[in-house]
């Protein structure tokens, strides 16, 4: 009776157990009673990341500049090249095949979370006593200006867009 | 220090059930495919079963098929062996064995063993 | 199923001797073969794996060679505590076998 399963690094054809390529290396032929499996590496630009019997290696990604995209980690005959956005951009997926702008955050919001080559900028609405005037990608909530400790008192109040407005405090006469 | 321990050996009636216990340590138990080989008094060795690293597959030697079943729990580092409807000739020393693919890049195509093994449990069937 | 036949089944020898065993299968198995040194009360110890490649930690004077279906254990000068039972397997696929044994006696 011929097997029907074989060990973590073995494959079942032709009622044999045969040696999987490693990592790096392609399937060229089974192996037999008397023979064993035949691998060849990998070429430049392709890569198997796994124990494997595949016959034709996997191209490395294209990190393609027009997309924003630029080189993170060079592949290998083991590994996938790994891509990521230029300076001020994000990818669209965790494949991160593509890249859009960092959202910036309109005034009355500040930034919670810069962003990153891989997730965008996280917007926080400005509490009471913060303010953002400004649309930005970096910048967080502003506190409001403390008029008592410049001996100043409020004379405009503040919004979650504006600071509030210090002047002198009224001289009895 | 990489280990093996087995228990749940004894004295049984014929058709009787047993389950034996393999407990791991000093190694990633996870990550290795596992075995269990038996021994009857003064004989030679004979595998009895075989499991993968995540318990997905399995495999008896005809002698034991449909009565025995191997299994693991990874996250109590424990391999299993459940013995049913066992027979005086199912007497021996049962021990659980790790697997190991030896394999260095350039000596391809690697090759398997049995680098570490337990003590052994004695599993006596009789009436 | 494979069978293995290992010759001879017991064999006498003197310190300082050279011996060999054999194991022959009943198919090819390429170097899937691993080879086990056993003493009374003790499980086995793994010596040779892919028919030729030293366990670490075994003395070199052991050896394996052979592929396809004929292969040898070889002890190059025996040592006291090589007294022994000797086994080889094939881990070539499911179900996989043992040899029936050496038994290695000083004289």
């Known amino acids: 009776e011929p097997p029907t399963a074989c060990r973590e690094k073995q494959y079942l054809i032709n009622s044999q157990c045969c040696s999987l390529c490693q990592p790096g290396q392609k399937l060229v032929s089974d192996c037999t009673e008397f023979t064993e499996t035949e691998c060849l590496p990998c070429g430049e630009s392709e890569f198997l990341d796994t124990w494997n019997r595949e016959t034709h290696c996997h191209q490395h990604k294209y990190c393609d500049p027009n997309l924003g995209l630029r080189v993170q980690q060079k592949g290998t005959s083991e590994t996938d090249t790994i891509c990521t956005c230029e300076e001020g951009w994000h990818c669209t997926s965790e494949a991160c095949e593509s890249c859009v702008l960092h959202r910036s955050c309109s005034p009355g919001f500040g930034v919670k979370q810069i962003a990153t080559g891989v997730s965008d900028t996280i917007c926080e609405p400005c509490p009471v006593g913060f303010f953002s005037n400004v649309s930005s990608a970096f910048e967080k909530c502003h506190p409001w200006t403390s008029c008592e400790t410049k001996d100043l008192v409020v004379q405009q109040a503040g919004t979650n867009k504006t600071d509030v407005v210090c002047g002198p405090q009224d001289r009895l006469r | 220090e990489v280990q093996l321990l087995e228990s749940g050996g004894g004295l049984v009636r014929p058709g009787g059930s047993l389950r034996l216990s393999c407990a791991a340590s000093?190694?990633?138990?996870?990550?290795?495919?596992m075995n269990w080989v038996r021994q009857a008094p003064g004989k030679g060795l004979e595998w009895v079963s075989y499991i993968s690293s995540s318990g997905e597959t399995t495999d008896y030697a005809d002698s034991v098929k449909g009565r025995f079943t191997v299994s693991r729990d990874n996250s109590k580092n424990l391999l299993y062996l459940q013995m049913n409807s066992l027979r005086a000739e199912d007497t021996a020393v049962y021990y659980c064995?790790?697997?190991?693919?030896?394999?260095?890049?350039?000596?391809?195509?690697?090759?398997?063993?049995?680098?570490?093994w337990g003590q052994g449990t004695m599993v006596t069937v009789s009436s | 199923d494979i069978q293995l036949t290992q010759s001879p089944s017991s064999l006498t020898a003197s310190v300082g001797d050279r011996v060999t065993i054999t194991c022959r299968s009943s198919?090819?198995?390429?170097?899937?073969l691993a080879w086990y040194q056993q003493k009374p009360g003790k499980p086995p110890k793994l010596l040779i794996y892919?028919?030729?490649s030293l366990e670490g930690g075994v003395p070199s004077r052991f050896s394996g060679s052979g592929s396809g279906t004929d292969f040898t254990l070889t002890i190059s000068s025996l040592q006291p505590e090589d007294f022994a039972t000797y086994y080889c397997q094939q881990l070539n696929s499911f179900p996989s076998t043992f040899g029936q044994g050496t038994k290695l006696e000083i004289k």
């Open positions: 064995a790790r697997d190991v693919f030896f394999f260095d890049s350039s000596g391809f195509p690697g090759a398997y063993g049995m680098d570490v």
């Open positions: 892919g028919a030729s």
């Open positions: 000093g190694f990633t138990f996870g990550s290795y495919e």
């Open positions: 198919q090819g198995i390429r170097s899937s």
